[in-house]
Amino acid sequence: ASFFGENHLEVPVATALTDIDLQLQFSTSQPEALLLLAAGPADHLLLQLYSGRLQVRLVLGQEELRLQTPAETLLSDSIPHTVVLTVVEGWATLSVDGFLNASSAVPGAPLEVPYGLFVGGTGTLGLPYLRGTSRPLRGCLHAATLNGRSLLRPLTPDVHEGCAEEFSASDDVALGFSGPHSLAAFPAWGTQDEGTLEFTLTTQSRQAPLAFQAGGRRGDFIYVDIFEGHLRAVVEKGQGTVLLHNSVPVADGQPHEVSVHINAHRLEISVDQYPTHTSNRGVLSYLEPRGSLLLGGLDAEASRHLQEHRLGLTPEATNASLLGCMEDLSVNGQRRGLREALLTRNMAAGCRLEEEEYEDDAYGHYEAFSTLAPEAWPAMELPEPCVPEPGLPPVFANFTQLLTISPLVVAEGGTAWLEWRHVQPTLDLMEAELRKSQVLFSVTRGARHGELELDIPGAQARKMFTLLDVVNRKARFIHDGSEDTSDQLVLEVSVTARVPMPSCLRRGQTYLLPIQVNPVNDPPHIIFPHGSLMVILEHTQKPLGPEVFQAYDPDSACEGLTFQVLGTSSGLPVERRDQPGEPATEFSCRELEAGSLVYVHRGGPAQDLTFRVSDGLQASPPATLKVVAIRPAIQIHRSTGLRLAQGSAMPILPANLSVETNAVGQDVSVLFRVTGALQFGELQKQGAGGVEGAEWWATQAFHQRDVEQGRVRYLSTDPQHHAYDTVENLALEVQVGQEILSNL
């Protein structure tokens, strides 16, 4: 049976076990694996791999027995190992692969394990003695019997028959995501100095998660996905969200080299060596990783994480997974394969997509253009100088290269003709008896951000043209509008004439044609990550941050962007936190990212907000955020009362007193007020922000946040002696906005 790192089987054991004859045969490459647990309230038997060694713990009544295999014999070597544990007549014996490893006397009492047997993992069992146990098994249990009875039957749907080939797959075998809920989890992706994630992606999914790494602080994460057929990366760090899109389409069923690079200053995603990166804005301070690196899918926690945050990801999108495969996976330069995965769901070893994607001819056209895919540009002087053979016509004296190259200048997103002046011959062609039509250009490597378009029949496919075509304006470069200011084409130039000339011209010379891109200022625009509707509770305030709206501007940093709120300034509901009552008609992108702004509702129908964002040169079209104010609904979540000794004090915590509201993504202020006199004590609040040792003061009102921070308590002040327990009825009312709930 195959266990994938998060699965287990359960077996009932209603009556006590007097004798134990347990036989397991397992194989795994993981040094940690929980093999079997027989669980009772106190009694238990645990078999696990820890650091590659088998450990057995048997607790019977008050006695505890521990056995383990020698440190030099590691059992996490993917080879099947047979373990036999017998407990008979007060004697426990452990043997592995036929060799006696340990034995010891044990109490004669039967093993009381009414919670049952857990094979391969402990499920949701939360018992004190399970703290620090190994991860669930990722590997195979070829056999498991207790007193001659199989523990592997019946199998549940997530534990598979046989031994899956993914457990023995080497790291050159692709990770196949066969869906619909595929997922592979690897050890955490650390990005302290810098982090890199590289793989070759083949998929037709237009929307799919690729990588997710949660951070140690609640809410931090790195997320890479396919969004509308393109790669997108999001880093959520503290208050700042960085969102990055790549323009290369990836959902075409062809292999694409993907690289994600992150450091403290910059995030870069590159597809087939076409990079997109953030400006050095410095919001990417170190993200302490928490949990596993998830590839190709999301678990429930990651889905929740993303839905709570700024991306406006729908639940369907987060529940979907990649359909396709990842090859040549490396994390921070270390190769990773299925064997290193901590857990997998619905995975296959190797790249087996839909049948039609894998017909041979699907790769035919890909092969034809493989030479055009940009790579790192070679660091060499081009062209290599040509040394003419002796005995050539005098025109070739001192000849080293055929052309003098000048940069092609193009406007961002514009077009420019390739002209004579860009590829000017160094010698007189007529004197060399060469015609312009015999000087043949071939594009051996295309530009990263544009295309050389040839207005010559059949030439576009061959990527070939002549110097005569250049003179006749048949070749023009079309830029794709991206922000990089430089690019280049690699041209191979050969001469097809049958006249005496240096052999290097017949073979061809390679030239780099630099392309200089004159930037064009792109106007910024406003995006609403969660949609253009915001809900607020009446008479409350709600933070306005990047989770509500953002500016998107490919060529401006946040520092250079300013928002304007359009409409009359009187009664404008947008304010700065530190300047209450003063309308904020204009604010910076930085202020928005820092969470300095709030929407304040003061009654009546909520006012919609129309914004414009400007980069100093151009402004975006206006964008409207529709705002709906709803009446607060308050519901008592907990009101349990307290028991305390006379003369003592006891904190009032959320477990004793808390309310819930109908706020949507809004942290509302909930005010409790005491409405009746207290007989036997007083309600107190701690001053100075709850600092240790700060004084407690009598209070008649406090906020739910004070309760959450442990800054509210009841102090019994009654000096009288009572023969019975006294009861203080604390009458409270709760206020949210202008809504009040009395008689709490």
């Epitope: 009932p12 009414p114 499920g123 207790l146 001659g148 199989s150 523990l151 039957r153 019946p154 199998l155």
Partner: antibody, heavy 122, light 107 residues
């Protein structure tokens, strides 16, 4: 003396609902996995649902034919198992047995209730 | 789902006869198979588990054998109280399934 006492059968119209109960005595109920098995002349004996222990997170398994319509549950404090049936169909007609198994020797049914008849008919 | 086919469906025998009932599984179930006896108006009761182990209190004239896909229940000397319907059940995989039954009648 182990006893599984069933109640709650009867006549119900198609599309209707019904709840069956099973009270157990004679063994520690909270240690046993509980099941419901039904029997009809057309389909013979048919396992329909299983519920595990609190330690197993009350894991539930169902036959495909009843998934989404039947819910098995248990109340360890009352030593009782239940089968809530909604959207009943004519083919759900039969004798319903409450059964248990408790030991690692296999998922066979060592204790059975007396059975209760459910008739789905208009 | 694993199908269990019992044969014969009906069997007429006399007291003292040796009776053999066969259960064939549509796929390998190892020894994860049980046999039950049911009398009219009663619930089934377990006879054999793990293909060959007698349940507590079951007389020794009942025996089970087989593994994989072929199983047999044998009653070595049929007694008057043995006239009933017998069912096999597999617990190798979900859903748990039963055979169609073999009715043993008095000849």
């Amino acid at each position: 003396q182990v006893k599984l006492q069933q109640s709650g059968g009867g006549l119900v119209q198609p599309g209707g609902s019904m709840k069956l109960s099973c009270v157990v005595s004679g063994f520690t109920f909270s240690n046993y996995w509980m099941n419901w098995v039904r029997q009809s002349p057309e389909k013979g004996l048919e396992w329909i649902a299983e519920i595990r222990l609190k330690s197993n997170n009350f894991g539930r398994y169902y036959a495909e034919s009843v998934k989404g319509r039947f819910t098995i549950s248990r109340d360890d404090s009352k030593s009782s198992a239940y089968l809530q049936m909604i959207n009943l169909r004519a083919e759900d007609t039969g004798i319903y047995y409450c059964t248990s198994y408790g030991n690692y020797v296999g998922h066979y049914f060592d204790h059975w209730g007396q059975g209760t008849t459910v008739t789905v008919s208009s | 789902d694993i199908q269990l086919t019992q044969s014969p469906s009906f069997l007429s025998a006399s007291v003292g006869d040796r009776v053999t009932i066969t259960c064939r599984a549509s796929q390998n179930v190892d020894t994860n198979l049980a046999w039950y006896q049911q009398k009219p108006g009663q619930a089934p009761r377990p006879l054999i588990y793990s293909a060959s182990y007698r349940y507590t209190g079951v007389p020794s004239r009942f025996s089970g054998s087989g593994s994989g896909t072929e199983f047999t229940l044998t009653i070595s000397s049929l007694q008057p109280e043995d006239f009933a319907t017998y069912y096999c059940q597999q617990y190798n995989s979900y859903p748990l399934t039963f055979g169609g039954g073999t009715k043993v009648e008095i000849k």
